[in-house]
């Protein structure tokens, strides 16, 4: 079957937000891959997308993550919008209201986005097959 | 300080094209998606187009889909929409918009907004 | 595409009071959606983005509210710069599309 445009655009937007360090991508996040075995795909992007989104509330505006120079500022924004485009596009393809996240695991944001991205390629290599 | 500049407005017949630029200034435009947003005479909004901020995505309303093509040229800070086929209710006015600092395919910096007006 | 339906579509006002415009998606956005300000002849203005969030510059008279598919914008005390035309917009999904809007005028 034809891969969906959104898993196009999220692997797009994965390779950008992992080609960039910003001063928030070393924080953690909860690891919802460390015990994802009997967890739906549809449930996966949806637990993905609550991280996310849990993630660029708490320090959308953390000035831990605005930094000290118009540059860090710059990156920090375009950060955000990344995460807030990852977000809508993973909770498009889940097609779930909500999704319960309550791993004591965590990971670092970076490795996360990682973890993703290799996720979200294994499904493209495989729908476009 | 940031802004958006549209020019290459004006009047066209129907079926002819025309090209339209905005440039940027005050702001790295290889950062932002940008969009074009048209207000035809007396009413709302209407998107447009939106190309990301490397061109790697566009997308078009239904309404432009097939006629018009938006590109960019991050090099000369310069966003572009060409419009090929025009019909006489694309007459609007013509925005540029960059997407929001804070979130994506939001508004936050407009152009003045350039006329198009297609008749014959 | 998700359809917008902001409500009223004209509304007389005075100085001073509070009001509230509303507008309500065809389907579930969360909170993706923002507001702007329109004067005659002028590009638009952003107010709001994701539901909530007052866009930098904005005075705090101005506030959004709502997630899935009812919003409201509320300015509380209505000031002679304010009259104008009001436009929601969602950004959940494109193509990108805006309420019909709002138009505010002097009482």
């Known amino acids: 079957h034809k891969c969906d445009i959104t898993l196009q655009e999220i692997i797009k937007t994965l390779n950008s937000l992992t080609e960039q360090k910003t001063l928030c991508t070393e924080l953690t996040v909860t690891d919802i891959f460390a015990a994802s075995k009997n967890t739906t795909e549809k449930e996966t992007f949806c637990r993905a997308a609550t991280v996310l989104r849990q993630f660029y509330s708490h320090h959308e505006k953390d000035t831990r993550c605005l930094g000290a120079t118009a540059q860090q500022f710059h990156r920090h924004k375009q950060l955000i919008r990344f995460l807030k485009r990852l977000d809508r596009n993973l909770w498009g393809l889940a097609g779930l209201n909500s999704c319960p996240v309550k791993e004591a695991n965590q990971s670092t944001l970076e490795n996360f986005l990682e973890r993703l991205k290799t996720i979200m390629r294994e499904k493209y290599s495989k729908c476009s097959s | 300080q940031v802004q958006l500049v549209e020019s290459g407005g004006g009047v066209v017949q129907p079926g002819r094209s025309l090209r339209l630029s905005c440039a940027a200034s005050g702001f790295t435009l290889s950062s932002f998606g940008m969009h074009w947003v048209r207000q035809a005479p007396g009413k709302g909004l209407e998107w447009v187009a939106v190309?990301?901020?490397?061109?790697?995505?566009?997308y078009y309303a239904d309404s432009v889909k097939g006629r018009f093509t938006t590109s960019r040229d991050n090099s000369k800070n310069t966003l572009y929409l060409q419009m090929n086929s025009l019909r006489a209710e694309d007459t609007a006015v013509y925005y540029c918009a960059r997407e929001g600092s804070w979130s994506p395919d939001i508004f936050d910096i407009w152009g003045q907004g350039t006329m198009v007006t297609v008749s014959s | 595409a998700i359809q917008l339906t902001q409500s009223p579509s004209s509304l007389s006002a005075s100085v001073g009071d509070r009001v509230t415009i509303t507008c309500r998606t065809s389907?579930?956005?969360?909170?993706?959606l923002a507001w702007y300000q329109q004067n005659p002849g002028k590009a638009p203005k952003l107010l709001i983005y994701?539901?909530?969030s007052l866009e930098s510059g904005v005075p705090s008279r101005f506030s959004g509210s709502g997630s899935g598919t009812d919003f409201t914008l509320t300015i509380s005390s209505l000031q002679p710069e304010d009259f104008a035309t009001y436009y929601c917009?969602?950004?959940?999904?494109?193509?990108?599309?805006f309420g019909q809007g709002t138009r505010l005028e002097i009482k």
């Open positions: 190309i990301w901020y490397d061109g790697s995505n566009e």
């Open positions: 994701d539901a909530s």
């Open positions: 389907q579930g956005i969360r909170s993706a």
């Open positions: 917009q969602q950004f959940n999904s494109y193509p990108v599309t």
